[in-house]
Amino acid sequence: LIIGFGISGRHSITVTTVASAGNIGEDGILSCTFEPDIKLSDIVIQWLKEGVLGLVHEFKEGKDELSEQDEMFRGRTAVFADQVIVGNASLRLKNVQLTDAGTYKCYIITSKGKGNANLEYKTGAFSMPEVNVDYNASSETLRCEAPRWFPQPTVVWASQVDQGANFSEVSNTSFELNSENVTMKVVSVLYNVTINNTYSCMIENDIAKATGDIKVTESEIKRRSHLQLLNSKAS
């Protein structure tokens, strides 16, 4: 969480941002809140990006003002116009690109004053893994697949029964470049698995951590997976 204040001159207002991550090719949110004003027409929101000549987005007098928008953001940004009056200046960024990563500034002017806060935005690719029993293999084998990751993640296997065991010798991980030549498909195979055990396939890069669990018993197979974004710090 980053909390910024205005510095001098007119009164300062508190602006709060939260560091976040964007999944390339999908839509992302850059979060920013501020002390609200009673009149929408008195609120100016500007999003700036470090090193960029134009603006990322501007909202003033109750509507978007995009004459100064930088080319790299054209047609890809929107604020939640109906929520500005309650202090939400968050930016929706469509079709997140790898090059959208960087430091952003949420800058607010209201009748009460002005303030700003920076936000670190990471971009990459992350997806939920799915773990299945590989019935084509010669021995009991698990196959963990996740369709889109970037940068290249690490893959670690763990087991509930053999906690702390190192499975690197009995697993094999491969990364296959997807058609857009940026993201990669992750495939990891674990050999010599035992029945009545829960195995976890953990995929992690500096943006996200995802886990796929599988419990194999004689009578059934149970699966569970979850994904967590890393470094979501507020400012």
Epitope: E50, G51, V52
Partner: antibody, heavy 119, light 107 residues
Framework: EVQLVESGGGLVQPGGSLRLSCAAS????????MHWVRQAPGKGLEWVSA????????RYADSVKGRFTISRDNSKNTLYLQMNSLRAEDTAVYYC????????????WGQGTLVTVSS | DIQMTQSPSSLSASVGDRVTITCQAS??????LNWYQQKPGKAPKLLIY???NLETGVPSRFSGSGSGTDFTFTISSLQPEDIATYYC?????????FGQGTKVEIK
């Protein structure tokens, strides 16, 4: 220490060309938009050109559009200004300056390099 | 292009005096007004950005105010080292433009 050092200035005839360089050190060069600003002898400041941190966007003053080209090499931490079809009125000290945010001024400047266009 | 009109073009004041310089933009530039100090033979130095924000390391006797088209720069107590030319600059729209400068001298 954050530093910008210009070079490449000198005496050139009208119609001639010159390339100015600005070597940056002490900061992450690619994170900053960079600008060229000039000052004719005894006169005020005139903004000339700008380039985004990635090099993907450029802007020019009308007085130099079509004659000057701004560029950068982030691997060398260097900013350039290629000046063609030079005129007597281009005579000035040329400064490079950095701007982290598009609206918030130029916080670091070089010492300047003098360009004299005369026959 | 946005025209920036600075006044006065020069002034002479005593050490300790309050000095005020004004800058007027030909159209609304919101808060996008910066002030620079330039000493003879030196590069300009950023003092104030965003109309009223003091750049890191700049003495608190310097201040700025205003928004829209009318801006003011103030030195609350003039010091001998403040002898310089001061420029306003708009960064609302390209091309960024400067005022013509105000030369400050000591009486």
């Amino acid at each position: 220490e954050v530093q910008l050092v210009e070079s490449g200035g000198g005496l050139v005839q009208p119609g001639g060309s010159l390339r100015l360089s600005c070597a940056a050190s002490g900061f992450t060069f690619s994170s900053y938009a960079m600008h060229w600003v000039r000052q004719a002898p005894g006169k005020g400041l005139e903004w000339v050109s700008a380039i985004s941190g990635s090099g993907g966007s450029t802007r020019y003053a009308d007085s130099v559009k079509g004659r000057f080209t701004i560029s950068r090499d982030n691997s060398k931490n260097t900013l350039y200004l290629q000046m063609n079809s030079l005129r007597a009125e281009d005579t000035a000290v040329y400064y490079c300056a950095r701007g982290r945010w598009s609206k918030w001024g130029f916080d670091v400047w070089g010492q300047g390099t003098l360009v004299t266009v005369s026959s | 292009d946005i025209q920036m009109t600075q006044s006065p073009s020069s002034l002479s004041a005593s050490v300790g005096d309050r000095v005020t310089i004004t800058c007027q933009a030909s159209q609304d530039i919101s808060n996008y007004l910066n002030w620079y100090q330039q000493k003879p033979g030196k590069a300009p130095k950023l003092l104030i950005y965003d109309a009223s924000n003091l750049e890191t390391g700049v003495p608190s006797r310097f201040s700025g105010s205003g928004s829209g088209t009318d801006f003011t720069f103030t030195i609350s107590s003039l010091q001998p080292e403040d002898i310089a030319t001061y420029y306003c600059q708009q960064t609302d729209n390209f091309p960024y433009t400067f005022g013509q400068g105000t030369k400050v001298e000591i009486k």
